[in-house]
């Protein structure tokens, strides 16, 4: 499974699209910034088998896809950019799913790192809660956009580690 090559390119495209999606100046939102507790340790690929790492990546992108597929998200972002971004994420999910199937067949035990998956889910719950509390304001979405760019960047680091494991 040549995940890292295809996935890294897709991730870079997703980051560029997300960068282009900004609608208001982030400098008007400094007071709205929030520590969502990005579980950075879950992006340390050295502690995972390849299958586990792919599962964490999948969860990360699935949750990002879900977040940007809501009605509130549709109202917040320019439609064509949002569609391109979602399509990019969807394509990455398909690639990852194909990789998981392939990798599981090669490993003796398809280990799932439940703690890591849970940490990622809780992280996105905190993001969703923040948006709800801020009533999905433009600044709240701007803060979340920056946070998702940060998390996608971390997942890029995980992909680099995966590439070395190939």
């Amino acid at each position: 499974c040549d995940l890292p090559q295809t996935h890294s390119l897709g991730n870079r495209r997703a980051l560029i699209l997300l960068a282009q999606m900004g609608r208001i100046s982030p400098f008007s939102c400094l007071k709205d910034r929030h520590d969502f507790g990005l579980p950075q340790e879950e992006f340390d690929g050295n502690q995972f088998q390849k299958t586990q790492a792919i599962s964490v990546l999948h969860e990360m992108i699935q949750q990002t896809f879900n977040l940007f597929s809501t009605e509130d998200s549709s109202a917040a972002w320019e439609q064509s950019l949002l569609e391109k971004f979602s399509t990019e994420l969807y394509q990455q999910l398909n690639n990852l799913e194909a990789c998981v199937i392939q990798e599981v067949g090669m490993e003796e035990t398809p280990l799932m790192n439940e703690d890591s998956i849970l940490a990622v889910r809780k992280y996105f719950q905190r993001i969703t809660l923040y948006l709800t509390e801020k009533k999905y304001s433009p600044c709240a979405w701007e803060v979340v956009r920056a946070e998702i760019m940060r998390s996608l960047s971390f997942s890029t680091n995980l992909q680099k580690i995966l590439r070395r494991k190939d």
Epitope: G22, S25, R33
Partner: antibody, heavy 120, light 111 residues
Framework: QVQLQESGTVLARPGASVKMSCKAS????????MHWVKQRPGQGLEWIGV????????TYNQKFKDKAKLTAVTSANTAYMELSSLTNEDSAVYFC?????????????WGQGTTVTVSS | DIVLTQSPASLAVSLGQRATISCRAS??????????MHWYQQKPGQTPKLLIY???NLESGVPARFSGSGSGTDFTLNIHPVEEEDAATYYC?????????FGSGTKLEIK
């Protein structure tokens, strides 16, 4: 690798204007904010402002609002800063620096600096 | 504007000892879990180099002898053990609100 190449030393007369450049390479120029920072000889650092090359959005330190104008040409991967109505106080080294860590607003890569000397 | 007061203005520390630099903000630069204070090192004739971001996070590639701490208005940069190559001027910078400002700098000399 990431590089920010700034224009060379500038000598200007009081009252004149100067425009300096900062050519970026090794990264996606349009997706990172670019800060500009002033450093007078033997003194500290002052934040002038920031530009987003992707759409030209700018934010200034009010102190420099009427002094500096930030622009960018994406086709040339180059950011510019124009300083107007120069006085001796504007004699300094000016750095362009790439924004880092998204909304943490730190600065990772720095240009080598453009030295501006204002003298009659 | 938030004023950052660094102290001392200069200090001389023996090789292998601890250097402690303080940065006090005129107003809190912490909000919702993050402290928006960062530290830079500038050697003579060179550009500043990011050492620490968000008060305590070590930038990639920076030696572990550098550490940062603090929240609200009071922040500290520690270097231990000090090495010859650490001779430089150190600046704090906040990004809590506009305009971002820097401290006046602390010059570290190695004895």
């Amino acid at each position: 690798q990431v590089q920010l190449q700034e224009s060379g030393t500038v000598l200007a007369r009081p009252g004149a204007s100067v425009k300096m450049s900062c050519k970026a390479s090794g990264y996606s120029f349009t997706t990172y904010w670019m800060h500009w920072v002033k450093q007078r000889p033997g003194q500290g650092l002052e934040w002038i402002g920031v530009i987003y090359p992707g759409n030209g959005d700018t934010t200034y330190n009010q102190k420099f609002k009427d002094k500096a104008k930030l622009t960018a040409v994406t086709s040339a991967n180059t950011a510019y800063m124009e300083l107007s109505s120069l006085t001796n106080e504007d004699s300094a080294v000016y750095f362009c620096t790439r924004n880092y860590k998204y909304d943490y607003y730190t600065m990772d890569y720095w240009g080598q600096g453009t030295t501006v000397t204002v003298s009659s | 504007d938030i004023v950052l007061t660094q102290s001392p203005a200069s200090l001389a520390v023996s090789l292998g000892q601890r250097a402690t630099i303080s940065c006090r903000a005129s107003k809190s630069v912490s909000t919702s879990g993050h402290s928006y204070m960062h530290w830079y090192q500038q050697k003579p004739g060179q550009t500043p180099k990011l050492l620490i971001y968000l008060a305590s996070n070590l930038e990639s590639g920076v030696p572990a002898r550098f550490s940062g701490s603090g929240s609200g208005t009071d922040f500290t940069l520690n270097i231990h053990p000090v090495e010859e190559e650490d001779a430089a001027t150190y600046y704090c910078q906040h990004s809590g609100e506009l305009p971002f400002t820097f401290g006046s700098g602390t010059k570290l000399e190695i004895k």
